[in-house]
Amino acid sequence: ITQQDLAPQQRAAPQQKRSSPSEGLCPPGHHISEDGRDCISCKYGQDYSTHWNDLLFCLRCTRCDSGEVELSPCTTTRNTVCQCEEGTFREEDSPEMCRKCRTGCPRGMVKVGDCTPWSDIECVHKESGTKHSGEVPAVEETVTSSPGTPAS
């Protein structure tokens, strides 16, 4: 996911609705004006704000990368939701890119979890049932399987 820079909005476009801040804050879907006296709406499909705020700009919408599918579009109150394409996943410790799921488990291990957009296949030792570390095995050690079918 590419999080763009924040979008300054120093001049309100004619279509942007204005209202007054409540307790110094503007509602989701708005940002505060530079003089602090008005709430200016974010631009649909361009930027958003999710909470009551006194930000001087709305947050720019995320654009889904190639290799991602758009689950839901950006609205004035919610950012775009992107998901890795089938056969790829995004790890918590490297959320900036989708990685290819492994095609199978190392020898002596059995697959217990499928490839999902947020996790690689899950392998456990046949005997002990302990999980594999997740290191990609050497090709000759791999027992391949097509997605969604258990390894033999």
Partner: antibody, heavy 117, light 110 residues
Framework: EVQLVETGGGLIQPGGSLRLSCAAS????????MIWVRQAPGKGLEYIGF???????YYADSAKGRFTISRDNSKNTLYLQMNSLRAEDTAVYYC???????????WGRGTLVTVSS | DIQMTQSPSSLSASVGDRVTITCQAS??????LSWYQQKPGQPPKRLIY???TLASGVPSRFSGSGSGTDFTLTISSLQPEDFATYYC????????????FGGGTKVEIK
Amino acid sequence: EVQLVETGGGLIQPGGSLRLSCAASGFTVSRYAMIWVRQAPGKGLEYIGFITSDGSTYYADSAKGRFTISRDNSKNTLYLQMNSLRAEDTAVYYCARYTYSDGTDLWGRGTLVTVSS
Amino acid sequence: DIQMTQSPSSLSASVGDRVTITCQASQSISTYLSWYQQKPGQPPKRLIYKASTLASGVPSRFSGSGSGTDFTLTISSLQPEDFATYYCQPNSGIATYGAAFGGGTKVEIK
């Protein structure tokens, strides 16, 4: 002349309370957001909190619960009520005028608060 | 909250030197950043706002640049009266995120 003057500082014992005042002249405090900032001896600037033009108040985590910002529009004066004072609250306390896009454009000269037994 | 990381914390320079101070925000603040100068025993004085707009009465040797998370204050030719401490402060979302100042940069005579 547009200016801010803080008063009310002095020596106070730990656990005590103090109210600082910030008198504005040349402009109307209720038309601006106003901010309190402090500076411990030899240290940097520390944001305490602010009050919006509509009277809403917001505080830094370190000030929540012990410090209260208020305003008297008829006196054109801002206040900082400080309770349960500790030695680490010893600092010069500044009030300042805050404009949303343009930053803190007008500062008072500060008042020194010393918390010591 | 937004954290502001200022560097260096101190520097030694001579009159006439070009001095650069940087400030990094923990999240993007567009161009809504101010720079302040403080001399001993005095309150801070605003130098620059909106990252690059010079405040009234501030000499043109001071300039600011940057947007997003990375900002720079430059003094093109250091003068004797410029030896002071400099602070940055974000100006967007003070209620939302707080208004923590950078840690300060003390500019000393070499």
